[in-house]
Interface confidence: low
Amino acid sequence: TIPPHVQKSVNNDMIVTDNNGAVKFPQLCKFCDVRFSTCDNQKSCMSNCSITSICEKPQEVCVAVWRKNDENITLETVCHDPKLPYHDFILEDAASPKCIMKEKKKPGETFFMCSCSSDECNDNIIFSEEYNTSNPDLLLVIFQ
């Protein structure tokens, strides 16, 4: 993925399809890479990222990564191709319109990651357990 200052000049709406034939066009995502964050012990947080970019590739989705260790908390916002692992993890929730954080096992830190495929969906990251994909209302939103 190219950096946001380059990406801002990209003006291309090429489209690809997913495995089900659903049409995909370049996503608009928050793209601040890694920034320090004050997001902690909250049901949801805003990214506080002021950079919106059109993703370089049509198949890319929005991703947010929240990490906490003994020293600091960071939030990473990027575009990424869901066919490829990110931080060694598969983007299993890439079809979701909302960025629902899921904890991943990483030694020495608390690590949450989410991905989603609606415009700027990684601006609002959701930790609350009430937003999981067993919620029929959320499934309705995803597949309508």
Partner: antibody, heavy 122, light 107 residues
């Protein structure tokens, strides 16, 4: 119910300026990219501009680039189009429209306002 | 820019007729095409997206097909409320250009 209501159109001289507004209701305005599309009298549709939900990203048709500015105020659920250095060929009905948020809609504009007429004439 | 050409530019038909409108792109756009209906003095309304998917609330007599450069909008049995102008639009590249429109009139 999704509603988009444009205002601000009118008669303006060539070289003049006008600011269009589009008041949105019935949906979460700040998560949708919004577009302006225009239609000259008796002619077809022409895409003008798009702005992302946060306002962080904008794109323009070549015909208006450098003269028009799209913006939004999410606290007021309002979309704007600032039109400067207006020309006779900018005369049209201007529609604001919501870009579908979901990828299977191909970025189609799924809801439109009723339009506001801009006439550029001396 | 990708050019979109619709044909015919106008047609006359009767209630109950089967109506077909075609749209041709100047280059391949895969299946990335939308159809809109516009009535006089009104805003356009999305009918079909992704060449063949019916927008919610649109009657099933409307259907779309095609891929690559050639696309078709079909109204299986024309109703009085269907007399309008129809536009195709490609979403393959910026700017998302429209066809010039096809006016469906009462015979």
């Amino acid at each position: 119910e999704v509603q988009l209501v444009e205002s601000g159109g009118g008669l303006v001289q060539p070289g003049g300026s006008l600011r269009l507004s589009c008041a949105a209701s019935g949906f979460d305005f700040d998560i949708y990219a919004m577009t302006w599309v225009r239609q000259a009298p008796g002619k077809g549709l022409e895409w003008v501009s798009v702005i992302s939900g946060s306002g962080g990203t904008t794109y323009y048709a070549d015909s208006v680039k450098g003269r028009f500015t799209i913006s939004r105020d999410n606290s007021k659920n309002t979309l704007y189009l600032q039109m400067n250095s207006l020309r006779a060929e900018d005369t049209a009905v201007y529609y604001c429209a919501r870009r579908s948020q979901y990828r299977d809609k191909v970025g189609a504009t799924d809801y439109w306002g009723q339009g506001t007429l801009v006439t550029v004439s001396s | 820019d990708i050019q979109m050409t619709q044909s015919p530019s106008s047609l006359s038909a009767s209630v109950g007729d089967r109506v077909t409108i075609t749209c041709r792109a100047s280059q391949s756009i895969s299946s990335y095409l939308n159809w809109y209906q516009q009535k006089p003095g009104k805003a356009p309304k999305l009918l079909i997206y992704a060449a063949s998917s019916l927008q919610s609330g649109v009657p099933s007599r409307f259907s779309g097909s095609g891929s690559g450069t050639d696309f078709t909008l079909t109204i299986s049995s024309l109703q009085p409320e269907d007399f309008a102008t129809y536009y195709c639009q490609q979403s393959y590249s910026t700017p998302p250009t429209f066809g010039q429109g096809t006016k469906v009139e009462i015979k």
